[in-house]
């Protein structure tokens, strides 16, 4: 049968040969001529055969973690007869570990993030170290974790590589650390190799911090032109903490004139000074208001941190401007009669200039030929009014600061012109009246009406009559319907066409002014050839006809 | 009776390659049941064994010289031959060819020796 | 590999004299494997002993081989002239084959 011993080779030899062990078959007495043959993966290469002597070489540098062992056949064979002495036997050769493998940190880049000022004890992240050595083979692939930097904030669990704070931290101090751990194999004892690996920490931010302002006092500036909401400056807090622990929030804390308000830009993390109301130099032209500012989030643990907000002083100075006047009135409105005569006086506008320097103002109408306005804003006429050409005068009268021409104020003075009664009632059209020659007393030629261009006070009342020519020798009466018109009527019976054929009646028309004015209207009646029926439409159309030259039948 | 000859060149330069033939005669190296060996032996010096041949072309060498070593046979010539390769002054010696019995394993015939000397 | 030694380094006796010879193996050495060889100025050495105690072709009884183990002796029975030389031990029990250092047989 064969003779062996288990077969080991230790990785990483450095000689060419390194002798393995022996094949022998216990039928080698030294008296036959045996030959040993060396079969399967790795011989020939890996492995030779002195197949004289059964012995066996390693001729190559073997690694174990590359391949730990060699499964390979054994054959011996009598030379002299060919044949087989002992039946092909397969053979294990082992690959011995040799701590030639230092601990590798395969997870690199390691690096993690805690909060700020987390308690002693804190896990922060664990690092692994793996060993390609055999775990098998006495403590070549054993492993021991120790801090090499980092001390004394953090700490490692040797066996475990388990990294904890061992000191409270700020970020606000240093917002990272470097640690670097070093993993031995063999326990640590001598012989030992090591990796290490670096883990980068970062702090968390927390909000620690409550915002401060960096200045105890602000001056800013206001124009007292500034219409409301405009911002007349910017305040700023510092806040050491990051991200939304530094997001604040900006208010007042004082401002008895409420005339200043603070917004917040959540960008830029300033409080913007907004004019609230609009300011007046000469009224007052300074102001001082309290700022306070605290933070736009804060976890009920961390109101320790906030307990006292930080304020600010804030002096605000307004700024003179040169205004323009100012009208006592934003509006005017004057009335004057028409027919004054040139000159009359209308009404005073006053404007001053509200600044302290108190310029003289000067005075003018715009675009006007029928008012004139003086130094001292006062309005007359520079013609005679009709009211019934204009009742009312829109006129824009300007205000003019004489040590600054270009300060201007404007503003509208209306003029009503009074109504006198200077106009007499008149016709309200040409009237042209037409009377049958059979025509019988009593019978209605015409109903008349009047105007007045006056304006009425109450009401207007017109009174209708013939002129006492008229009234005399007329043949033609008047009834006046009391509501302004009147009738015309025949005051006989029959006119002839070829003696009288057209008359001209004086109607006077009389107003209820005072005091009364009458107008004398002639009222024009022809005479007219009518049919059996008495028609006016005939007789209308036979004199539309004569007064177009036509002859009628 | 078997005869070996060994035959080569007796001057080598350093970094060159050895190369010596043994010639037998009086018997055929394919008839086997013999190695073939080379054996070496400083001047004033002991032997040194270099290793062997099989006719069959197996090969054994001493493991020392190994990465410098090859044997080669041409059973058609009867001859084997030692290649040694990277020589230095330490490689000058008398070269031995013999013939190993398969059964005793002992050297029972020599070639006369050829004395190869390494030097520029 | 197997050192082996041999003693002494040098014997010097007269011919007719009774020659032993040591050689000593680092380990056991199976005595199939041990021979004896004799080397004269100038020639190759020649096979005298193999298995430890068989004679070679041609050589005289009056050498004999003996031991095992670690320890193996070369008997020269009667000296006779020629047999003044260098005696060389060597092994193939196992790889690779090793040589003694030698024995040098000087006439007294």
């Known amino acids: 049968g064969w003779v062996w011993n288990q077969f080991f080779v230790p990785e990483e030899m450095n000689t060419t040969s390194h002798h393995v062990g022996r094949l022998r078959s216990d039928l080698d007495n030294g008296n036959n001529s045996f030959q040993y043959k060396l079969l399967g993966a790795g011989a020939g290469s890996t492995f030779i055969i002195d197949e004289r002597t059964g012995d066996i070489y390693a001729i190559e540098k073997l690694d174990r973690e590359e391949r730990s062992l060699y499964i390979l056949r054994a054959q011996v064979i009598d030379i002299t007869t060919g044949r087989a002495v002992e039946p092909e036997s397969e053979f294990v050769i082992k690959v011995s570990d040799i701590n030639d493998n230092e601990p590798k940190f395969l997870d690199e880049p390691y690096e993690a993030i805690v909060p700020e000022m987390s308690p002693e004890g804190t896990l922060v992240i664990q690092v692994t170290a793996s060993d390609a050595d055999d775990p098998s083979s006495g403590n070549n692939a054993r492993l021991l974790y120790s801090l090499l930097q980092g001390q004394p904030y953090f700490s490692v669990e040797p066996t475990t590589g388990v990294i904890r704070i061992s000191s409270k931290m700020d970020r606000e101090l240093q917002d990272e650390y470097w640690v670097i751990i070093q993993a031995k194999d063999m326990i640590g004892q001598p012989g030992a190799l090591s990796g290490t690996t670096s883990v980068l920490i970062k702090l968390s931010d927390v909000n620690d911090n409550k915002p401060i302002f960096k200045e105890s006092l602000y001056r800013l500036t206001v124009s007292e032109s500034a219409p409301t909401g405009t911002s007349i400056g910017t305040i700023m807090a510092y806040d050491n903490d990051i991200g939304e622990n530094a997001e604040m929030d900006y208010s007042i804390e004082e401002d008895d004139s409420q005339t200043f308000d603070i917004i917040t830009n959540h960008e830029t993390q300033e409080g913007i000074v907004i004019l609230k109301k609009k300011v007046n130099f000469e009224h007052q032209n300074h102001y001082g208001i309290r700022a306070k500012v605290k933070n736009h989030h804060v976890d009920e643990q961390l109101m320790k941190y906030h307990t006292e907000a930080s304020t600010t002083f804030i002096k605000i100075q307004v700024e003179d401007v040169d205004e323009p006047p100012l009208f006592l009135l934003p509006y005017y409105i004057f009335e004057i009669f028409e027919e004054t005569p040139q000159g009359s006086f209308v009404g005073v506008v006053s404007a001053t200039d509200p600044d302290n320097r108190k310029s003289p103002i000067r005075y003018s109408i715009t675009r006007s030929k029928v008012f004139n306005i003086d130094d001292n804003g006062t309005i007359t006429t520079t013609n005679s009014l009709d009211r019934e050409i204009s009742a009312w005068y829109n006129l824009s009268i300007t205000a003019t600061e004489k040590y600054n021409i270009e300060q201007i104020s404007s503003i509208p003075v209306y003029v009503q012109v009074l109504n006198i009664n200077d106009h007499a009632p008149e016709f309200s059209q040409y009237y042209e009246s037409y009377v049958c020659e059979n025509a019988g007393s009593g019978q209605v030629i015409q109903t008349i009406s009047a105007v007045d261009r006056d304006e009425s006070i109450e009401e207007h009342h017109f009174y209708f009559n013939l002129s006492v020519e008229d009234t005399n020798s007329s043949s033609f009466t008047i009834i006046d319907n009391q509501d302004n018109t009147a009738v015309i009527l025949t005051n006989r019976t029959g006119f002839n066409l070829q003696e009288e054929p057209i008359f001209y009646i004086s109607i006077l028309i009389a107003d209820n002014g005072i005091p009364s004015l009458t107008s004398t209207n002639t009222l024009t009646i022809h005479v007219c050839d009518c049919d059996d029926s008495g028609s006016t439409q005939t007789c209308q159309y036979q004199e539309l006809m004569l007064s177009m030259g036509f002859k009628t039948e | 009776q078997v005869q070996l000859q060994e035959s080569g060149p007796g001057l080598v330069k350093p970094s060159q390659t050895l190369s010596l033939t043994c010639t037998v005669s009086g018997g055929s190296i394919s008839s086997g049941g013999y190695y073939w060996s080379w054996i070496r032996q400083h001047p004033g010096k002991g032997l040194e064994w270099i290793g062997y041949?099989?006719?069959?072309?197996?090969?054994f060498y001493n493991p020392s010289l190994r990465s410098r070593v090859t044997i080669s046979v041409d059973t058609s010539k009867n001859q084997f031959s030692l290649k040694l390769s990277s020589v230095t002054a330490a490689d000058t010696a008398v070269y031995y060819c013999?013939?190993?019995?398969?059964?005793?394993?002992?050297?029972?015939?020599w070639g006369q020796g050829t004395l190869v000397t390494v030097s520029s | 590999e197997i050192v082996l030694t041999q003693s002494p380094g040098t014997l010097s006796l007269s011919p007719g004299e009774r020659a032993t010879l040591s050689c000593r193996a680092s380990q056991s050495v199976s005595s199939s494997y041990l021979a004896w060889y004799q080397q004269k100025p100038g020639q190759a050495p020649r096979l005298l002993i193999y298995?430890?105690?068989s004679r070679a072709t041609g050589i005289p009884d009056r050498f004999s081989g003996s031991g095992s183990g670690t320890d193996f002796t070369l008997t020269i029975s009667r000296l006779e002239p020629e047999d003044f030389a260098v005696y060389y031990c060597?092994?193939?029990?196992?790889?690779?084959?090793?040589f003694g250092q030698g024995t040098k047989l000087e006439i007294k």
């Open positions: 013999a013939r190993d019995s398969s059964s005793s394993r002992a050297l029972d015939y």
């Open positions: 298995g430890a105690s």
């Open positions: 041949i099989y006719y069959s072309g197996s090969t």
């Open positions: 060597q092994q193939y029990d196992s790889s690779p084959r090793t």
